[in-house]
């Protein structure tokens, strides 16, 4: 029973993570613009997503600016969307897994194999979430560098944006609920070992032979 | 008008030192980064050393560490150079320069003032 | 450390002609390349930053371009005020380097 509720709580977390994963790699926030000089009169913000980059004016309006050409973009921003995709096509590959190996269908009958595809699914999971682990830190990296890099100029400054939290959330939640599916089947699966230890019990008496109640004519 | 004027320079021998001044005007110079690079005759230009807005935080290459002391005076507008140990391969045009907001790297350049190292 | 290397290391061409110098970085700097033209007797000054962009007051016959580790700056037209030495410099991380230049003249 406290398997299942495992499952249960790693496949919620896991599907908590996918809708943050989304939300992040979808947002435009993933660097934010950071006014540092104290000369510098702050009139808008600029927002930089993977697929568009906004403007909010101090008035509140936003106009948002889809990429043109894939071609013309930076390498490491191409990258990023391609992790997040697959990121994101890895983890609902996991579901789907996990949904083929629940305690709950009958995709599959054998205990033995619905243990394996959890545990499959959860490996998938955790996969996932390195997955979406890896554009989140590359850009903060970058972030972070470029702040303390002192050739770099102040309006070229960036802050870590919301979408790069909710990266990190959408990668904690996806390794933690990957890593509970993982530990609800030890050994190819959580029932395994107790199934056969009742099989076997029944066949072997209660206490043990000493040596000497054992045939002696098995013996050389 | 943003106006650098380097001075300080001239003729040293081999182990000396020497002190190179840069009188910044025509901009609130505590707000920006400084810069020193040289450059050798008929050589590249190279990158001396860098000093925060602030202060603060300073960044030297490994050719001059030790060696080099940037330092700055935000109420003079002054920015300061030390060079101990000097080398004969030190000798260079020393131009001292201004980040930018806007733009990256070395925006604006001084005139330069000749360092030469000879015995 | 990061080296720089810029070619040609000089040339020699028409007024109106179109003129490419590149550089090439010994590893990835990603686009933290800035380009400086340095005219006779003169300090160096700024042309473009982060590879591509341009500095105010900077003539758009002046454009530069990335393509990974290689960096080219173009002039479009080459005008006579355009004689030089040009030199490329990275500030992806220090040392920050600068290109052995290319000095430009007219034919």
């Known amino acids: 029973m406290a398997s299942a509720g495992m499952q249960i709580l790693g496949v919620v977390l896991t599907l908590l993570g996918w809708v943050n994963g989304l939300v992040s790699c979808a947002l435009p926030m993933w660097k934010v613009t950071a006014f540092i000089g104290n000369s510098i009169v702050v009139a808008q913000v600029v927002w930089e997503g993977l697929w568009m980059s906004c403007v909010v004016q101090s008035t509140g309006q936003m106009q948002c600016k889809v990429y043109d050409s894939l071609l013309a973009l930076p390498q490491d921003l191409q990258a990023a969307r391609a992790l997040c995709v697959i990121a994101l096509l890895v983890a609902l590959f996991g579901l789907l897994v996990y949904l083929a190996g629940a305690k709950c269908t009958t995709c599959v009958e054998e205990k033995d194999s619905k243990a394996r595809l959890v545990l499959t699914s959860g490996i998938v999971f955790v996969i996932s979430g390195v997955l979406t682990l890896i554009p989140v830190c590359w850009t903060a990296h970058a972030i972070i560098r470029d702040f303390y890099n002192p050739l770099v100029a102040e309006a070229q400054k960036r802050e870590l944006g919301a979408s790069l939290y909710l990266g990190w959330a959408a990668s904690g939640l996806l390794l933690l609920g990957g890593g509970l599916l993982c530990c609800t089947c030890p050994s190819g699966g959580s029932q395994g070992p107790s199934h056969y230890m009742a099989r076997y019990s029944t066949s072997a008496p209660a206490i043990s032979r000493g040596p000497s109640e054992y045939p002696t004519k098995n013996y050389v | 008008e943003v106006q650098l004027v380097e001075s300080g320079g001239g003729l040293v021998k081999p182990g000396g030192s020497l002190r190179l001044s840069c009188a910044a005007s025509?901009?609130?110079?505590?707000?920006?980064?400084m810069s020193w690079v040289r450059q050798a005759p008929g050589k590249r230009l190279e990158w001396v050393v860098t000093?925060?807005?602030?202060?603060?935080?300073?960044y030297y290459p490994d050719s001059v560490k030790g060696r080099f002391t940037i330092s700055r005076d935000n109420a003079k507008n002054s920015l300061y150079l030390q060079m101990n140990s000097l080398r004969a391969e030190d000798t260079a045009v020393y131009y001292c320069?201004?980040?930018?907001?806007?733009?990256?790297?070395?925006?604006?350049w001084g005139q330069g003032t000749l360092v030469t190292v000879s015995s | 450390d990061i080296q720089m290397t810029q070619s040609p290391s000089s040339l020699s061409a028409s007024v109106g002609d179109r003129v490419t110098i590149t550089c090439r970085a010994s590893?990835?700097?990603?686009?933290?390349l800035a380009w400086y033209q340095q005219k006779p007797g003169k300090s160096p000054q700024l042309l473009v930053y982060?590879?591509?962009l341009l500095v105010d007051g900077v003539p758009s016959r002046f454009s530069g371009s990335r393509s990974g580790t290689q960096f080219s700056l173009t002039i479009s037209s080459l005008q006579p005020e355009d004689v030089a030495r040009y030199y490329c410099?990275?500030?992806?991380?220090?040392?920050?380097?600068f290109g052995s230049g290319t000095k430009l003249e007219i034919k």
């Open positions: 410099q990275h500030y992806y991380s220090e040392p920050y380097t």
């Open positions: 000093i925060s807005s602030g202060g603060g935080r300073t």
């Open positions: 320069i201004r980040g930018d907001y806007r733009y990256d790297a070395f925006a604006y």
């Open positions: 025509g901009f609130t110079f505590n707000d920006y980064t």
């Open positions: 982060a590879s591509t």
């Open positions: 590893e990835n700097i990603d686009s933290y």
